[in-house]
Interface confidence: medium
């Protein structure tokens, strides 16, 4: 047979469908690999062929389109299951060809079981809602193309295992679920079950997504540097370890990149000829506000290092801020004999001002 452009196994499209539900799967060739659509290919005399490899088998075999009630069928560039069975799991290939042209791609299809509370190994999309932001909606995903607009399906919404009815702030509105005002207790998995008739049979589509309530843009502020601050002085003797934490609070901002970095004498630590290590930790609030801490560490600080300028910088989509750490060389306490000889008669020791020391 003639050479075929083989795009291999497209693992980017890990298609998961529920057992005993309809599934429509478009051939990925036209969506991601070729620059023309199915109609153009069909007009040019190209034929779309489907075959598959069962789970744990190497043998490619044709798809049986002659099953009772046309359980598996093809319509244009879509492979239909009405409905799926567990043993439909495998790698499916669609091949576009004529006598002079051939292109094919394979993709994995996993038929997944769910329990009565819609729990399953299905990877769930995440939808973020802003806390206390007014009415926001989620829409039952991936149901287009399953039934014509003349068919009026029934849609039931669930939170976890519970049918959504008489919830304080969540109202089902057909394909949409409206959150009058979103609270953190609205976090969770939401499932829409779409029921529609087709040729005397009733089919169900189950779609689950995860709602995560996040900080509202109306409450978002530029980064806030909690440390270093004016209350803390890093006073060290040469040879001691210098540890300065830079702790920054970032409001949640959709698609914002939160950055924290140190400069020493205006340069990145990598560009300074001293042995500096920086360790970062990140924590999140219940609304995905972020606290980043970068601890700057110099194991054995020198007198020269204690004269340098250490500045913590932070940036988000809301702005950029910076704060310098107050670093000083500790003045050794005068020895008692010297005190007497010099006639100071001091009773205390140290610098006479109050310091917090971070270790």
């Amino acid at each position: 047979s003639e050479r075929c452009d083989d795009w291999g196994l497209d693992t980017m499209r890990q298609i998961q469908v529920f057992e005993d539900e309809p599934a429509r799967i478009k051939c990925p060739l036209f969506e991601h690999f070729l620059k023309f659509n199915y109609s153009t290919a069909h007009s040019a005399g190209l034929t779309l062929i489907w075959y598959w490899t069962r789970q744990d088998r190497d043998l490619e075999e044709p798809i049986n389109f002659r099953l009772p009630e046309n359980r598996i069928s093809k319509e244009k560039d879509v492979l239909w299951f009405r409905p799926t069975l567990l043993n439909d799991t495998g790698n499916y290939t669609c091949m576009l060809r004529n006598t002079t042209y051939c292109s094919k791609v394979a993709f994995p299809l996993e038929v997944v079981q769910k329990d009565s509370c819609f729990n399953s190994p299905m990877k769930l999309p995440v939808h973020k809602l802003y806390i206390e932001y007014g009415i926001q909606r989620i829409t039952c995903p991936n149901v287009d193309g399953y039934f014509p607009s003349s068919v009026k399906p029934t849609i039931t919404w669930y939170m976890g295992c519970y049918k959504i009815q008489n919830f304080n702030n969540v109202i089902p509105e057909g394909m949409n679920l409206s959150f009058l005002i979103a609270f953190i207790s609205n976090n969770g998995n939401y499932t829409c079950v779409v029921t529609y008739p087709e040729n005397g049979r009733t089919f169900h589509l189950t779609r689950t997504l995860t709602v995560k309530v996040v900080g509202s843009p109306k409450n978002a502020v530029p980064p806030v540097i909690h440390s270093p601050n004016d209350h803390v002085v890093y006073e060290k003797e040469p040879g001691e370890e210098l540890l300065i934490p830079c702790t920054v609070y970032f409001s949640f901002l959709m698609d914002s990149r939160n950055e924290v970095w140190w400069t020493i004498d205006g340069k990145k630590p990598d560009d300074i000829p001293i042995d500096v290590t920086i360790n970062e930790s990140i924590s999140h609030s219940r609304t995905e506000d972020e606290t980043r801490t970068q601890i700057l560490s110099i194991k054995k600080v020198t007198s020269e290092d204690l004269k340098r300028s250490y500045v913590c910088h932070a940036r988000s989509a809301k702005g950029e801020v910076a704060k310098a750490a107050t670093v000083k060389q500790k003045v050794p306490a005068p020895r008692y004999t010297v005190e007497l000889a010099c006639g100071f008669g001091a009773t205390g020791s140290g610098s006479g001002s109050h310091h917090h020391h971070h270790h």
């Epitope: 519970y162 304080n168 702030n169 609270f183 207790s185 969770g188 924590s283 999140h284 609030s285 219940r286």
Partner: antibody, heavy 122, light 107 residues
Framework: QLQLQESGPGLVKPSETLSLTCTVS??????????WGWIRQPPGKGLEWIGS???????DYNPSLKSRVSISVDTSKNQFSLKLSSVTAADTAVYYC??????????????WGQGNLVTVSS | DIQLTQSPSFLSASVGDRVTITCRAS??????LAWYQQKPGKAPKLLIY???TLQSGVPSRFSGSGSGTEFTLTISSLQPEDFATYYC?????????FGGGTKVEIK
């Protein structure tokens, strides 16, 4: 008026499992803006959050107790329960159940049970 | 975990005094802070939530302020029934944590 009432044994032997139930009256445990929590207070000491549950069964636990703690909810009985396994004398405390209200978006334990003193001793 | 440090631990005051209790968080918690009052042998009672919002039914002599890492509970004029232990609690992130408490005693 919402009320919470803890029930369960006041004495548990070391290495056994502590079991407490909180019965909610005057309101539904299935309200969509409430979490239900357990907090404990050793004699003469401060408060420690053990964990919280939502009516759907979703839980959050204090990492310091996570390996030993389990919180469950029974919406039909309007109750939620705490189980703490492998107890030691350090688990002796007054155990409170409480409602965490989210309707302001800011949370707080606005209703508490009267507390149940559990002593771990052989 | 977010640590909450309350100060002072003990406070002696007289009826009519203005009393201030401070709660410092180990990291920024926005306004996700509540204040509770606890009397011996009783469950804690919510006074303030969202750092500064007075819980329904709580006398207006109680007020809360602060945001980020520094928070304050103020009793403008101490009454006999206010002698108790006060706790702050952060609800910003899990695990939820409480301050160590401030005991307000009669001078």
């Amino acid at each position: 008026q919402l009320q919470l009432q803890e029930s369960g044994p006041g004495l548990v032997k070391p290495s056994e499992t502590l079991s407490l139930t909180c019965t909610v009256s005057g309101g539904s445990i299935s309200s969509s803006t409430y979490y239900w929590g357990w907090i404990r207070q050793p004699p003469g000491k401060g408060l420690e959050w053990i964990g919280s549950i939502y009516f759907t069964g979703s839980t959050d636990y204090n990492p310091s107790l996570k390996s030993r703690v389990s919180i469950s909810v029974d919406t039909s009985k309007n109750q939620f329960s705490l189980k703490l396994s492998s107890v030691t004398a350090a688990d002796t405390a007054v155990y409170y159940c409480a409602k965490e209200d989210d309707s302001s978006g800011y949370y707080s334990f606005d209703y508490w049970g009267q507390g149940n003193l559990v002593t771990v001793s052989s | 975990d977010i640590q909450l440090t309350q100060s002072p631990s003990f406070l002696s005051a007289s009826v009519g005094d203005r009393v201030t209790i401070t709660c410092r968080a180990s990291q920024g918690i926005s306004s996700y802070l509540a204040w509770y009052q606890q009397k011996p042998g009783k469950a804690p009672k919510l006074l303030i939530y969202a750092a500064s919002t007075l819980q329904s039914g709580v006398p207006s002599r109680f007020s809360g302020s602060g945001s980020g890492t520094e928070f304050t509970l103020t009793i403008s004029s101490l009454q006999p029934e206010d002698f108790a232990t006060y706790y702050c609690q952060q609800v910003n992130s899990y695990p939820l944590t409480f301050g160590g408490g401030t005991k307000v005693e009669i001078k």
